[in-house]
């Protein structure tokens, strides 16, 4: 029978670490990490790490009992967890009978938004105490709410990942800019900033009809030339506070007709907030 892995949590040191080993198995040949999505009962989905590793092909594989993988995550707080993956059989061949190196994977470490992870792996039995054993490590940075997969997570949806404010802005005269955008039921407070190198105008927008999606309009006094300036719209939603996804648009000249601004000149861009 071909070896497979059975993985379980092992946060402390491996028992083998306390034992003296004349020989230890060789190091890993490759270690890779990629995110995978899995459905959860709440109708949402979670992102997990698919950690895969390749064993070096030589006779030292015969000593191999397990591979231990540890993950450290750094964002607002630090996390640390390890799994030990035991091989179910002794290795009878240095490569798979069908060809290629022995490759295994573990899916289970949860991935939080916008977090830097350090993934380390080593074979067991590992080096003796006070000796350096062969190990391998890789970094993995999880994407934020702007990512095409992450944006559908409930946490991201509540932070406005699917909201398109369809910002339009035009220079009415030298002193004012008119900004229009589509509101969202996610919140009722917004901040509109006009930037041209520096902030040349801003306004708080309070939209009381929170349950409905409406088109809001605000006229903002400016202190400099506003044509070509950037409009930044910052929403304030309960789930993300002042760290919600920001959207941008560009100020153009208002047309002379009764239409306040051209609707086809939508420069709305996803902002840079990553919860």
């Amino acid at each position: 029978r071909e070896p497979t892995v059975q993985c379980g949590s092992e946060t402390g040191p491996s028992p083998e670490w306390m034992l003296q080993h004349d020989l230890i198995p060789g190091d890993l040949r490759d270690l890779r990490v990629e995110p995978v999505t899995t459905s959860v009962a709440t109708g949402d989905y979670s992102i997990l790490m698919n950690v895969s590793w390749v064993l070096r092909a030589d006779a030292s594989i015969r000593l191999l009992k397990a591979t231990k993988i540890c993950v450290t995550g750094k964002s607002n707080f630090q996390s640390y967890s390890c799994v030990r993956c035991n091989y179910t059989e002794a290795f009878q061949t240095q490569t798979r009978p069908s060809g290629g190196k022995w490759t295994f994977s573990y899916i289970g470490f949860p991935v939080e938004l916008n977090t830097v992870y350090f993934i380390g792996a080593h074979n067991i039995p590992n080096a003796n105490m006070n000796e350096d054993g062969p190990s391998m490590s890789v970094n993995f940075t999880s994407p934020g709410c702007l990512d095409h997969i992450m944006k559908y997570k409930k946490k991201c949806v509540k932070a406005g990942s699917l909201w398109d404010p369809n910002i339009t802005a035009c220079k009415k005269n030298e002193e004012t800019v008119e900004v229009n955008f589509t509101t969202t039921p996610l919140g009722n407070r917004y901040m509109a900033l006009i930037q041209h190198s520096t902030i040349i105008g801003f306004s708080q927008v309070f939209e009381p009809h929170q349950k409905k999606q409406t088109r809001a309009s605000v006229v903002i006094p400016v202190t400099g030339d506003s044509e070509g300036a950037t409009v930044q719209l910052t929403p304030y939603f309960p789930t993300c506070g002042s760290d919600c996804i920001r959207h941008k648009g560009t100020v153009v000249l208002c047309p002379q007709t009764g239409v306040p601004f051209p609707l086809d000149n939508n420069k709305s861009k996803p902002g840079g907030w990553l919860p």
Epitope: G26, D58, A59, R62, Q92, Q94, S98, G99
Partner: antibody, heavy 118, light 107 residues
Framework: EVQLVQSGAEVKKPGASVKVSCKTS????????MNWVRQAPGQGLEWMGR????????QYNQKFKDRATLTRDTSISTAYMELSRLRSDDTAVYYC???????????WGQGTLVTVSS | DIQMTQSPSSLSASVGDRVTITCRTS??????LAWYQQKPGKAPKLLLY???NLGDGVPSRFSGSGSGTDYTLTISSLQPEDFATYYC?????????FGGGTKVEIK
């Protein structure tokens, strides 16, 4: 039945290159590493290197790293060993050898005599 | 690299004799050792692997023992077809190395 059939004897001048082939049959070519071993006249066996036909990973004996090139063609289940900048002391029988488990060599080619002489 | 020291380099024996060849390695190879027999003009033939396991079709008069750094090939009763050169080889990890060989000649 596993068979490894090597190309015929070669006579080369110093500085030239030689390419020896090893055609396999009777097993799945990509499943076993292919090793190359040489034996100078009246001398012992010397491991030159090995190639994994599955992904072309190669490991060399440092002695041959700069002059030996191991390749394979999976479509015809054949491994190759090319040795460049030949010297007279490269005169030897060159063997391909493989095994299904670890690198004990259960199966050998018949050998290819390469003579380097001016 | 692991060094392989094989002894003796040659020996003379008669049919029916018990013959012992030793192989010492420069470091523990955890029984990852093979023995080969080679006759003039022929490719080597695998006799034993993992220090003690007989290769396919190898007569039971051949046996192997040892562990760590010291290994032995024994021919319990030498037959006429056993006159040849014998090599040990480690396969613990590349680079693989062979012993210098032991030539078994007719006394």
């Amino acid at each position: 039945e596993v068979q490894l059939v090597q190309s015929g004897a070669e006579v080369k001048k110093p500085g030239a290159s030689v390419k020896v082939s090893c055609k396999t049959s009777g097993y799945t070519f990509i499943s076993y590493w292919m090793n190359w071993v040489r034996q100078a006249p009246g001398q012992g066996l010397e491991w030159m290197g090995r190639i994994d036909p599955y992904d072309s990973e190669i490991q060399y004996n440092q002695k041959f790293k700069d002059r030996a090139t191991l390749t394979r063609d999976t479509s015809i289940s054949t491994a190759y060993m090319e040795l460049s900048r030949l010297r007279s002391d490269d005169t030897a029988v060159y063997y391909c050898a493989t095994s299904g488990g670890f690198d004990w060599f259960a199966y050998w080619g018949q050998g290819t005599l390469v003579t380097v002489s001016s | 690299d692991i060094q392989m020291t094989q002894s003796p380099s040659s020996l003379s024996a008669s049919v029916g004799d018990r013959v012992t060849i030793t192989c010492r390695t420069s470091e523990n190879i955890y029984s990852n050792l093979a023995w080969y027999q080679q006759k003039p003009g022929k490719a080597p033939k695998l006799l034993l692997y993992d220090a003690t396991n007989l290769g396919d079709g190898v007569p039971s008069r051949f046996s192997g023992s040892g562990s760590g750094t010291d290994y032995t090939l024994t021919i319990s009763s030498l037959q006429p077809e056993d006159f040849a050169t014998y090599y040990c080889q480690h396969f613990w990890g590349p680079p693989y190395t062979f012993g210098g060989g032991t030539k078994v000649e007719i006394k």
